[in-house]
């Protein structure tokens, strides 16, 4: 039995943060349990991860790199992505794991969120201004 | 809950060679890493060398470069510290860590479970 994760199909992060929620087809409340993101198509970079249980407060871990948040729902972990560089526009995934109670469960991988990071755009100030009026 | 379980410490003449291993049990995901940190006598505990799951991912101390290697066995949960050319500085407690992250930390606190530690001493 898996575990159903379902995701935004695409994100845009126009002000270099972005919140990615993953909605679960189970109830997390009362679950051990370690949510993590992934970036790439092989999901070869785990950037954060949630660790949950029930007799702790949420754990929240971030890779060099990235700077990441975390919050908990029933049934959903909302990653909360901060100082994202134009560089790391990519596909994101979604995996659970549930340790405890038994059965240990995993999910299904999801389709991913494409997390397409915008790059701040200042306009420039003139290089010659013109005279400034009274 | 994860219990870490450390050996392999001892006493070394300087230049000599140590492996430390630090077991664990309980409740594994299928990522997480694990390291190596040590505190010296009124020193702060400090990172020496962490792997991740899939052992693709390992960074170590610039103090202990090529001198110490982190290595694993998942089949046995098991991290080892391969230490040489062994100094006076090395003398400290060894502590193994276990973290839900899955990459190699060096960062303390990303640490939720630590060994009882073994010591280690470099004398001629």
């Known amino acids: 039995n898996k575990i159903l994760v379902k995701q935004s199909p695409m994100l845009v992060a126009y002000d270099n943060a972005v919140n990615l929620s993953c909605k679960y087809s189970y109830n997390l409340f009362s679950r051990e349990f370690r949510a993590s993101l992934h970036k790439g198509l092989d999901s070869a970079v785990e950037v954060c991860v949630v660790y949950g249980n029930y007799s702790q407060q949420l754990q929240v871990y971030s890779k060099t790199g990235f700077n990441c948040d975390g919050k908990l729902g029933n049934e959903s972990v909302t990653f909360y992505l901060q100082n994202l560089y134009v560089n790391q526009t990519d596909i994101y995934f979604c995996k659970i794991e549930v340790m405890y109670p038994p059965p240990y469960l995993d999910n299904e991988k999801s389709n991913g969120t494409i997390i397409h990071v915008k790059g701040k755009h200042l306009c420039p100030s003139p290089l010659f201004p013109g005279p400034s009026k009274p | 809950e994860v219990q870490l379980v450390e050996s392999g410490g001892g006493e070394v003449q300087p230049g000599g060679s140590l492996r430390l291993s630090c077991a664990a049990s309980?409740?594994?995901?299928?990522?997480?890493?694990m390291g190596w940190f040590r505190q010296a006598p009124g020193k702060e505990r400090e990172f020496v060398a962490a792997?991740?799951?899939?052992?693709?991912?390992?960074d170590y101390a610039e103090s202990v470069k090529g001198r110490f290697t982190i290595s694993r066995d998942n089949a046995k949960n098991t991290v080892y510290l391969q230490m040489s050319s062994l100094r006076a500085e090395d003398t400290a407690v060894y502590y193994c860590?276990?973290?839900?992250?899955?990459?190699?930390?060096?960062?303390?606190?990303?640490?939720?479970?630590w060994g009882q530690g073994t010591l280690v001493t470099v004398k001629p």
């Open positions: 860590g276990f973290t839900y992250a899955g990459w190699a930390s060096s960062g303390r606190d990303d640490y939720n479970y």
């Open positions: 309980g409740r594994m995901f299928s990522n997480y890493a």
């Open positions: 792997i991740n799951y899939r052992r693709d991912d390992a």
